[in-house]
């Protein structure tokens, strides 16, 4: 009817102007819509240029909404990562500070002459925790070998101990068990505790990294058209008050975010594995108990060496021969008093329990992040209709939306009526991130069993993918040992996004 043909475009002018566009583009009254490429071609208040501007704007608004949702998740993961990292580093730093404060009094020169070896051990533990590609068991074995060499020389200043004799001492060491049970106990407990701590924190880092990278995946042109139709075509067609039908919105966003929804299974697996590994934070081999008590194992070891000195010396002489005596050297070192230190078991501070319960709750909350994203964005960002079904915008007019809601993920979009999705072409960035989630989940599962996946030959298949941007400093190219010259492949999982807290230490 002629009256409807000349309906005013006042409301559209208002909305279009509010978006910052020039009002000179907007017709005063409706015009014929044959020129429209996205919206239905009825009478319209939108020119070609307006349709294009609004299409670009709707695309940008969806990407912004997507990034905002991702940013909230990233911020939560980053906060968790920082809290746990601070706590674990604090435990280790506390242990080192206790050692520096108590060992000089407890052990005198047996400590002060070897302070560098102890400092190095803590630095290596710190590096290992932060993702350096080093073998923890080898690191500990090396530490004990170096310490034995130095302490044996100190306890026998009257003996001439050339390198070949010290080499022989080193070869005998394993059988002699000079430090008693401490090295074995520390190795078993520290390996489990550090592997659990570092893999959990790495898990948070990988999750955060995945969210960040996925948020940068551009939305395709088919999605842009569908979102324009969803958000702004009602305005162009003179029904600016009509809000999108909920199921219509879900179908558009399920089509747009089909690839993202494919992260769901591996995302859940990762979060489940992370929740599971927190079980390893408790008990005598737990993270808090072990990382905070490294110094007590070291004290036990030195005490054991002093207690076993005479037996040890006799066995070394038996295996390596009689060393020459330095005629000008002093007599044997006086047996020192045993170093008295606080008991090994640290009373739990409560901090870790609080951190873990918060983390578990938050990780559970975001388990369905990827599949709930279309629904979340529709309800929070798209101003959905709450009116009865036949009063909402269905993409063509005000009325009921009849198609069924699609399932989640790429494969389920084959018949999506709103977005043309090529299910044979998955997004490669998202596939890579699915692989990163899988790799990290495997690390966590290995860590749950007390194994460090980096040093299981079975997993060393030479393959692997990933951004490679997670390594701090040049940790990832580190060689693994002073004795062997083998090096390993770089890691891709050293705490992404974590800045080095402990810089180079100078003294």
């Amino acid at each position: 009817d002629p009256a409807s043909k000349s309906r005013s475009c006042g409301e559209v002018r208002q909305i279009y102007g509010a978006k910052g566009f020039s009002l000179s583009d907007v017709p005063q009254a409706e015009i014929s819509g044959e020129h429209l490429r996205i919206c239905p071609q009825g009478y319209t208040c939108c020119t070609s240029e307006m349709e294009e501007n609004l299409a670009n704007r709707s695309h940008a608004e969806l990407e912004t909404a997507l990034r905002d949702s991702s940013r909230v998740l990233q911020a939560m993961l980053a906060t968790q990562l920082r809290s746990f990292d601070d706590h674990f580093q604090h435990l280790l730093n506390d242990s080192e500070r206790t050692l520096q404060a108590t060992f000089p009094g407890a052990f005198g020169e047996l400590y002060t002459q070897n302070a560098r070896a102890f400092r190095d051990l803590y630095s290596e533990l710190r590096l290992y925790y932060r993702g350096a590609n080093l073998h923890l068991e080898e690191t500990l074995a090396e530490f004990w070998a170096r310490l034995l060499e130095r302490l044996f020389k100190q306890l026998h200043p009257q003996l001439l101990l050339p390198d070949d004799y010290l080499d022989c001492l080193g070869k005998q060491a394993e059988a002699l068990r000079p430090f008693g049970e401490a090295p074995r106990e520390l190795r078993l407990r520290a390996t489990r505790a550090f592997v659990a701590a570092r893999s959990f924190v790495q898990g948070l880092g990988v999750a955060s990294d995945v969210v960040r990278k996925v948020a940068q995946v551009p939305l395709g042109p088919e999605c842009s058209r569908a979102v324009m139709k969803l958000v702004y075509c009602a305005h162009c067609l003179g029904v600016p008050g009509a809000r999108p039908c909920p199921d219509y919105c879900r179908n558009v966003l399920k089509g747009c975010l089909a690839n993202q929804a494919d992260l769901d299974a591996e995302w859940r697996n990762l979060l489940d594995s992370m929740v599971l590994i927190t079980d390893k934070f408790w008990g005598t081999s737990g993270v808090e108990s072990v990382i905070g008590s490294v110094h007590t194992w070291l004290a036990e070891a030195i005490n054991a060496l002093q207690d076993n000195r005479d037996t040890l010396t006799a066995k070394v002489i038996q295996g390596c021969g009689n060393p020459k005596v330095n005629p000008q050297g002093p007599g044997p070192e006086e047996k020192r008093r045993r170093g008295k230190l606080a008991p090994r078991e640290r009373p739990p501070s409560g901090t870790l329990e609080k951190l873990v319960s918060e983390a578990k709750a938050q990780l559970r909350d975001v388990q369905d992040f990827w599949i709930s994203l279309p629904g979340t964005l529709c309800s929070e960002k798209m101003a959905l209709s709450t009116a009865s079904d036949d009063r909402c915008w269905n993409g063509m007019a005000r009325g009921r939306y009849l198609p069924e809601v699609m399932g989640d993920g790429l494969a389920n979009q084959i018949n999506n009526p709103e977005v043309e999705v090529d299910i044979t072409k998955p997004d490669m960035t998202i596939r890579q991130q699915i692989m990163q989630l899988k790799i990290m989940t495997n690390r966590l599962r290995s860590a749950y069993n007390g194994n460090d996946v980096d040093f299981q030959d079975a997993s060393d298949d030479g393959s692997g993918s990933g951004s490679g941007d997670g390594c701090l400093d040049d940790l990832c190219s580190r060689k693994v040992s002073r004795k062997s010259s083998s090096s390993r492949t770089p890691l891709t999982h050293a705490l992404p996004g974590l800045s080095e807290q402990e810089g180079q230490k100078t003294s």
Partner: antibody, heavy 119, light 107 residues
């Protein structure tokens, strides 16, 4: 066999900085501390500091602490010594030296790098 | 820092002579004392470590002794290639320090 190869001679103006490199080969680079020792013309040897190539931890002689920075690059098995705010008395041959074992004994030395500070 | 005092500052001896250089430290360094030889234009070379251990490849005419604060380096039969400056160094604790050197010349 263990080899330490240092960068070439440098001529610097007072107030400038110099960065000397020392490339290691023939052993596991991260397994042994590396030290820097300097020797002014006709003078004795002076220890400047040490770096643990495995961890990057450093210990400097108090005399140089404000001006020296030791770093390492494990991917190229190279350590670096940078000395800033150069003055004429920093004219010297700078040596890198590797420990024998974990013992502060310098069993292997670089060939030396002459740094001349002159206006 | 531990001070190192070497004596003599220089000495001149004939081929085949036995010579001794001493090194005294300002505080005990236990047995953590090392000796180096340096010829003009070359880097120092380790001779003796931990007061009395001969570094591999060093001729047996070189020997070291001492403990605590007093140490000595002895060349039992001086050879022409021994003309050099000799330095003691402690590795007891940082900062490691060197003696001022003893210049040995052949008469």
């Amino acid at each position: 066999q263990v080899q330490l190869v240092q960068s070439g001679a440098e001529v610097k103006k007072p107030g400038a900085s110099v960065k000397v490199s020392c490339k290691a080969s023939g052993y596991t680079f991260t397994g042994y501390y590396m030290h820097w020792v300097r020797q002014a013309p006709g003078q004795g040897l002076e220890w400047m500091g040490e770096i643990n190539p495995s961890t990057g931890d450093t210990t400097y002689n108090q005399k140089f602490k404000a001006r020296v920075t030791m770093t390492r690059d494990t991917s190229t098995s190279t350590v670096y010594m940078e000395l800033s705010s150069l003055r004429s008395e920093d004219t010297a041959v700078y040596y890198c030296a590797r420990e024998k074992r974990d013992d502060g004994v310098f069993a292997y030395w670089g060939q030396g790098t002459l740094v001349t500070v002159s206006s | 820092a531990i001070q190192m005092t070497q004596s003599p500052a220089s000495l001149s001896a004939s081929l085949g002579d036995r010579i001794t250089i001493t090194c005294r430290t300002s505080q005990t360094v236990a047995g953590y004392l090392n000796w180096y030889q340096q010829t003009p234009g070359n880097a120092p070379k380790l001779l003796i470590y931990s007061a009395s251990n001969l570094q591999s490849g060093v001729p047996s005419r070189f020997s070291g002794s001492g403990s605590g604060r007093d140490f000595s380096l002895t060349i039992s039969s001086l050879q022409s290639e021994d003309s050099a400056t000799y330095y003691c160094q402690h590795s007891y604790s940082t900062p490691y320090t060197f003696g001022q050197g003893t210049k040995v010349e052949i008469k």
